[in-house]
Interface confidence: low
Amino acid sequence: HTAAQDNCTCPTNKMTVCSPDGPGGRCQCRALGSGMAVDCSTLTSKCLLLKARMSAPKNARTLVRPSEHALVDNDGLYDPDCDPEGRFKARQCNQTSVCWCVNSVGVRRTDKGDLSLRCDELVRTHHILIDLRHRPTAGAFNHSDLDAELRRLFRERYRLHPKFVAAVHYEQPTIQIELRQNTSQKAAGDVDIGDAAYYFERDIKGESLFQGRGGLDLRVRGEPLQVERTLIYYLDEIPPKFSMKRLT
């Protein structure tokens, strides 16, 4: 099924409008902003989520512009163009005809240009490093327990295949989660690491995208894991093309 049948909602995306107008009266859900049908048995693409977020009335938005510590994605929010599959279009432009190229997670990877800017392909982000700093605890978490808990979280909550969680590093109070997923590794139906990282980022900020679920309650052997700050680095299969001498 594509959505919860009993009350016709989308368990994996609360930024949707659902109605029982699918084939055979089945519940069908469409993303706000784009009106695109979404598969509620898996994560919605980040592009559609950003579009939905930008279309929501200002007073209904739960997230403000990221702080300066949202390091790599430092351009803040924008209303993206998504392709028919819900992926980011390689070229994004704003209302003032300023354009730039993005990677598969929607982060700018070129200088800003004008409408003549060409973005030949959507470059895949194949390696994501999520840096977390947790609040002080009585002692350090056991690394093995922490590793297992974070892998379980990505497998069960975000439906990300464990093989894509490359590593969990820990040096109190810093936790680093490495997600890796090459184009050749991603099979049909696999959750994209970019989408999983975005859901995780929103969960950590207390702004869950899941319908009706409580916020993220991360515990390691019963001890709460409370995150102070999140920092996400994105590495692309093809290096970014900023016009600094070192990259030309």
């Epitope: 790599v72 700018r108 700093r133 680095y233 970014p240 900023f242 016009s243 001498k245």
Partner: antibody, heavy 121, light 107 residues
Amino acid sequence: EVQLVESGGGLIQPGGSLRLSCAASGFTVSNYWMNWVRQAPGQGLEWMGRIDPNDSETHYNQKFKDRLTITKDTSKNQVVLTMTNMDPVDTATYYCARSGFGSTYWFFDVWGQGTTVTVSS
Amino acid sequence: DIVMTQTPLSLPVTPGEPASISCKASQDVSTAVAWYLQKPGQSPQLLIYSASYRYTGVPDRFSGSGSGTDFTLTISSLQAEDVAVYYCQQHYSTPLTFGQGTRLEIK
């Protein structure tokens, strides 16, 4: 040739204001974070703040936040630093430097020659 | 703020000999560290970025290594023109911060 040229330095009275310009040539400032870094005589380097001239987003070192303003003049391909309530401890060489977008690129690949500012009565 | 601590603050080296400068970050900065040299009366010049990537035109006698909190700049064979003050900088988060500098001089 890619170049940054600072101007506006000189002698300033304590309590006065500083206005420095940084003119870029060989590249477009709106494609970069444009930063100001200062260096007191015989001392190390201190990052003051930066601007994205494309949308005027600024980030400041908290140490200077109340006194510092960085603005842009994209028509002249330049950025401007204004600092109020100058004190003798603000005597330094002030550099303009560019860096890329995304934290992987927040290092300074092009620097100006620097402009010397002396705060004294 | 992330504090970058350089050691030593002064390093006398014989020409042709190797030299190493250490930089320690007060918290994990992944590989987001750059190195600069500054010759007397000149602006700083970028040598290394992202811990180990040599900037365009930088001689290959300069190399960088490290990740997390500990970083090293190595000059494999010191030349007379390498006499300068060397600074590390973290480009991990704002405020961007520098080490206090290491003065490299000929022994």
